[in-house]
């Protein structure tokens, strides 16, 4: 493959380059839709960020699904999105970067980041909870991981995106894991607790991928994701048995997961804690 | 008890601009908790958004890319109403049309209150 | 722009019986899914917003759920006046679109 024998051009199995997608629709998970042929079909996988083979059941789903591994390719990856631009090009901002702050019409005041094109850095402004634009972060740390440009130009984000159904915005999520350690559990299970905005407080768990443990957390009964499991066992059964662990290069053997401590970025942490 | 009261003709030639004006009684059309709406329906479109104003600290609008270029949206503070004006109609813009509160009071938003409905027919 | 699919397009029931509308967005919402109820002539008429929240003076028999792209409307137990048409609506991005419709017919 000549695009490998590239001046400069880094492969990586442990740390992807921020994840710029060139179509929302990218970042949705495959939905296989409620009927029950067996088709199969493709998609794109933002958190291995490639396409992948999955059985579409005939009817429904979503826009994240296309008939050849090509048009899957055509549509979702730019330049093979999986590997590590090479440092003498500057990667480009995604277009939402550039447009103004957005409160949107709703009186929630939730405090938000965006990226200011003028100051170019990322500030802190109010967000009403609907509405609004793209432009639009949890946490500073996400604002300046996908918008701002790093010392040297560069942009210097180590994180994936997923599509947030707070208000449609392509939201990072870290997925780094120690690298002795690969996930090939469900996506979901790498996101962090999102306990939705209604008013109950139901007992339900969700994997954290950062401490390897299923955890407790209080839903509201309403929104969250889908990392959102009604019993520890459950949780369990769904995200614990994800991780592999890499003994060499070609590979792979399941493991019990039993890890020392290690350092972890800590904005996954933020993230994951701001949303208890 | 906050209510809607729409006004404006029924019947528009073609070319011409339909105006429909909606006065507002128990609340404001200031208000920086709700958006001031026009929505028409119609059998072939069903209910369709054509766009909103609202006031948080200045005057924004929004509207629905299909009648972008052709939609104004006024407020009107002095008399408490907005008003709503399409230029270049077609019989294709025939449909009941709704002026409506979007209630934007907290983390969600809402339309809460409709005024009576005025059917525009385009025709000559 | 977020398409609203609500399904059934229409549907009979019977006085008692439990209806069940669903609304399919194109993409994740948040919270800002509302419903509505519309008789011939009249204006639509707001019974749940915030997705599962009962709009003032609406009866307790009508109740909405749902997250990310799939919302309902339940009916418990369906009375003679609520033979309508049934809209959601999302106000979550612009532009706000609505489901086309869901009609409750008298079996």
């Known amino acids: 493959d000549s695009e490998e024998d590239e001046e400069h051009t880094i492969i990586t199995d442990t740390e992807l380059p921020p994840l710029k997608l060139m179509h929302s629709f990218c970042a949705f998970k495959a939905d296989d839709g409620p009927c029950k042929a067996i088709m199969k079909r493709f998609f794109f996988n933002i958190f291995t960020r490639q396409c992948e083979e999955f059985i579409y059941g005939g009817c429904e789903g979503n826009q994240n699904r296309f008939e050849s591994l090509e048009e899957c390719k055509k549509m979702c990856t730019r330049d093979n999105a999986n590997r590590i631009i090479k440092t003498t090009l500057q990667q480009e901002k995604p277009d939402f970067c550039f447009l103004e702050e957005d409160p949107g019409i709703c009186r929630g005041y939730i405090t938000r980041y965006f990226y200011n094109n003028q100051t170019k850095q990322c500030e802190r402004f109010k967000y009403g909870g609907c509405l609004g634009n793209m432009n639009n972060f949890e946490t500073l740390e996400e604002c300046k991981n996908i918008c701002e440009d790093g010392p040297n130009g560069f942009q210097v984000d180590n994180y994936g995106t997923q599509l947030n159904a707070v208000n449609n915005s392509l939201t990072p999520q870290s997925t780094k894991v120690p690298s002795l350690f690969e996930f090939h559990g469900p996506s979901w299970c790498l996101t962090p607790a999102d306990r939705g905005l209604c008013r109950a407080n139901e007992n339900r768990f969700y994997y954290n991928s950062v401490i390897g443990k299923c955890r407790p957390f209080k839903y509201s009964g309403c929104g969250g994701n889908e990392n959102n499991f009604t019993s520890k066992q459950e949780c369990l059964r769904a995200c614990k048995k994800g991780f592999i662990q890499r003994i060499s290069k070609g590979g792979l053997i399941k493991t019990k997961r039993k890890r020392k401590k290690q350092r972890v970025k800590i904005a996954y942490e933020e993230i994951f804690v701001k949303n208890m | 008890q906050v209510q809607l009261q729409q006004s404006g003709p029924g019947l528009v030639k073609p070319s011409q601009t339909l105006s429909l004006t909606c006065a507002i009684s128990?609340?404001?059309?200031?208000?920086?908790?709700?958006?001031w709406s026009w929505i028409r329906q119609s059998p072939g479109r069903g209910l369709e958004w054509l766009g909103m104003?609202?006031?948080?600290?200045?005057?924004?609008?929004d509207y629905a890319v299909s009648v972008k270029s052709r939609i104004t949206i006024n407020p009107d503070t002095s008399k408490n109403q907005f008003s709503l004006q399409l230029n270049s109609v077609t019989p294709e813009d025939t449909a009941v049309y709704y002026c409506?509160?979007?209630?934007?009071?907290?983390?969600?938003?809402?339309?809460?209150?409709w005024g009576q409905g005025t059917l525009v027919t385009v025709s000559s | 722009d977020i398409q609203m699919t609500q399904s059934p397009s229409s549907l009979s029931a019977s006085v008692g019986d439990r209806v069940t509308i669903t609304c399919r967005a194109s993409?994740?919402?948040?919270?800002?899914l509302s419903w509505y109820q519309q008789k011939p002539g009249k204006a639509p008429k707001l019974l749940i917003y915030?997705?599962?929240n009962l709009q003032s003076g609406v009866p307790s028999r009508f109740s909405g759920s749902g997250s990310g792209t799939d919302f309902t409307l339940t009916i418990s137990s369906l009375q003679p006046e609520d033979f309508a048409v049934y809209y959601c609506?999302?106000?979550?991005?612009?532009?706000?679109?609505f489901g086309q419709g869901t009609k409750v017919e008298i079996k």
């Open positions: 409506a509160r979007v209630n934007a009071n907290g983390y969600y938003a809402y339309v809460d209150l």
């Open positions: 915030g997705v599962s």
């Open positions: 104003i609202f006031y948080r600290s200045k005057w924004n609008n």
């Open positions: 609506l999302q106000v979550d991005n612009l532009p706000i679109t």
């Open positions: 993409q994740p919402i948040y919270n800002s």
């Open positions: 128990g609340d404001s059309v200031s208000s920086n908790s709700a958006a």
